[in-house]
């Protein structure tokens, strides 16, 4: 699952990891890009282990994965609000 | 050359506990993701359990969670799996296994096993 | 979860021979999918990563291929240490393994 939300006012991600998470483990992933009060774009992953994770956006892993998510999500219609579902 | 030994299998009844050790040598074994595969009567392979390199995060299927406990001790380059509450349906060879994901770009899953450790679960 | 459908349980084929074995996915596994050989009395080796990557020292007669749901293996000029069961396994959502694929030859 991907999702982007534009609604927090704060940062929330202390400190990011660059560490590699093989896909099989990521349960979803979260973007909250720049403004509404964080001046940086933050990336959280949910592990399938209910763990949570802040992960580097530079990080080149999270990068391929985010590109492999937009390309599976432009080929299949839109679901609403802020959420996709990707297989 | 990598080398995995299992060891600590048998016979156990309904509801008992037992615990799995395996021996890593001939790899750097704290840079390296581990993991627990069954073998089932059948001839099927199960996953089991799979521990970071680190120890910090583990997983498992449904079937096992809450059950089950996977550990590692980088120190004595050991791998450990305990199971309480055993059933029937446990009964398999248990394969320790290397799980290899170094980077995006290196991703090998399971690619080295040991020979397997047997244990039964019969009244 | 993921289920993966392997198929054929078994097959029987000659000596320099060619076999293939398919693994169907519930979902799209993005290529997310090896190939292993287990002789008994020994833990499986990995013979090919990501649907097509071949192991190091793993002869060129073995290869693998596909995409999406639908994959498979092959193994060409067989020989007699080819016996063996061969087992697919996904890594695309933790991990699943195919039923396997008892090899005889005739």
């Known amino acids: 699952v991907l999702e982007v939300y534009y609604t927090h006012l704060r940062c929330r991600c202390v400190q990011e990891s660059s560490v590699f998470i093989p896909r099989r483990f990521i349960d979803r992933i979260q973007i909250s890009p720049r403004g509404n009060g964080c001046p940086r774009k933050e990336i959280i992953v949910w592990k399938k282990n209910k763990s949570v994770v802040c992960v580097d956006p530079q990080a080149e892993w999270i990068q391929r994965i985010m590109e492999m998510l937009r390309k599976k999500s432009s080929s299949t219609p839109p679901v609403p609000v802020f959420k996709r579902k990707i297989p | 050359e990598v080398q995995l030994v299992e060891s600590g299998g048998g016979l156990v009844k309904p509801g008992g506990s037992l615990k799995l050790s395996c021996a890593a040598s001939?790899?750097?074994?704290?840079?390296?993701?581990m993991s627990w595969v069954r073998q089932t009567p059948e001839k099927r392979l199960e996953w089991v359990a799979t521990i970071s390199d680190g120890g910090s995060d583990t997983y498992y299927p449904d079937n096992v969670k809450g059950r089950f406990t996977i550990s590692r001790d980088n120190a004595k380059n050991n791998l450990y799996l305990q199971m309480s509450h055993l059933k029937s349906e446990d009964t398999a060879m248990y394969y320790c296994a290397r799980d290899y994901y170094g980077s995006s770009y290196e991703d090998y899953a399971m690619d080295y096993w040991g020979q397997g450790t047997s244990v039964t679960v019969s009244s | 979860d993921i289920q993966m459908t392997q198929s054929p349980s078994s097959l029987s084929a000659s000596l320099g021979g060619k076999v293939t074995i398919t693994c169907k996915a519930s979902q799209d596994i993005n290529k997310y999918i090896t190939w292993y050989q287990h002789k008994p009395g020994k833990g499986p080796r990995l013979l090919i990563h990501y649907t097509s990557t071949l192991q190091p020292g793993i002869p060129s007669r073995f290869s693998g291929s596909g995409s999406g749901r639908d994959y498979s293996f092959s193994i060409s000029n067989l020989e007699p240490e080819d016996i063996a069961t061969y087992y697919c396994?996904?890594?695309?959502?933790?991990?699943?393994f195919g039923g396997g694929t008892k090899l005889e030859i005739k």
């Open positions: 396994l996904q890594y695309d959502n933790l991990y699943t």
């Open positions: 001939g790899f750097t074994f704290s840079s390296y993701a």
